[in-house]
Amino acid sequence: AQEVQQSPHCTTVPVGASVNITCSTSGGLRGIYLRQLGPQPQDIIYYEDGVVPTTDRRFRGRIDFSGSQDNLTITMHRLQLSDTGTYTCQAITEVNVYGSGTLVLVTEEQSQGWHRCSDAPPRASALPAPPTGSALPDPQTASALPDPPAASALP
């Protein structure tokens, strides 16, 4: 079965710094999403080879991509405290497949010592339950489509 390898599990960075999240699969995708989880999940990007990436307005100008949709590294720049959260990759194949999540902790520089990542991956219990038809070792949110809310339409 298709899987999404996502790394890192957790990262602590100061305000203004950058973070890399990598989503790797065995191929055969239609595209991949990075979504910030929460009561109101928010799509951050949609990436599909050969198509202009879709980026949510909040991250416009702060996102870079390297690699391909099968092995994608997403770099989020100039992080703000409000960017703290769990981000998950969603690979679109014939089913939905999810990464294990990356907990990004953005801290004020002087308080970094108080907020550190443990070695454990983000707890699945903190994430919403998956749709019944999804293939998943990892529970997350369901399928998505490109073109951001309140963001300019991209081809």
């Epitope: 949510d56 999804s134 998505a144």
Partner: antibody, heavy 117, light 107 residues
Framework: EVQLVESGGGLVKPGGSLRLSCAAS????????MSWVRQAPGKGLEWVAS???????YYADSVKGRFTISRDNAKNSLYLQMNSLRAEDTAVYYC???????????WGQGTLVTVSS | DIQMTQSPSSLSASVGDRVTITCSAS??????LNWYQQKPGKVPKLLIY???SLHSGVPSRFSGSGSGTDYTLTISSLQPEDVATYYC?????????FGGGTKVEIK
Amino acid sequence: EVQLVESGGGLVKPGGSLRLSCAASGLTFSSYAMSWVRQAPGKGLEWVASISSGGFTYYADSVKGRFTISRDNAKNSLYLQMNSLRAEDTAVYYCARDEVRGYLDVWGQGTLVTVSS
Amino acid sequence: DIQMTQSPSSLSASVGDRVTITCSASQGISNYLNWYQQKPGKVPKLLIYYTSSLHSGVPSRFSGSGSGTDYTLTISSLQPEDVATYYCQQYSKLPYTFGGGTKVEIK
């Protein structure tokens, strides 16, 4: 049992507006993308718009700039705001659950929108 | 946009007959094809997704096959309750597009 119930259809004059609603029950609404599909009288199916669980939206060229799809996860509701309506928008509008980005596995009963002077 | 061409547009067959409906895409769609059934005056229902996977509750007389640009829906033994219009739909690329439909009637 998953259920989708549309409302808000009716008769409107060309250039007018309508807001369709779709109330969902029996599913974790916030976990699913949702779509609107329409069917003109005696015609086939036409995809109109979709919104992901995370809020990304997409529209058919025929409605882009006139229709807006949105959702309220707290109310388990999907919406379609339709502005600048034309006679060719006359159709039954269905909301559908989008299981895997285009795999529309549950449909509502539909609501009829008639655009006529 | 990907165009979906369905044939025939209508057919009439006897109960127990094997019925085949074809759908052709204007470009390869990598098996991202669904089939829907719409009975007269009713809501469309998903029959088959991803070319050949039977949706839950759908009778096994329905099957799907195909690859690349050409896809087929087969009803192995037509039943009176199968009178309906059948639509194919590609979901390889946005915008999602449907075939024009095939109306199936009983002789």
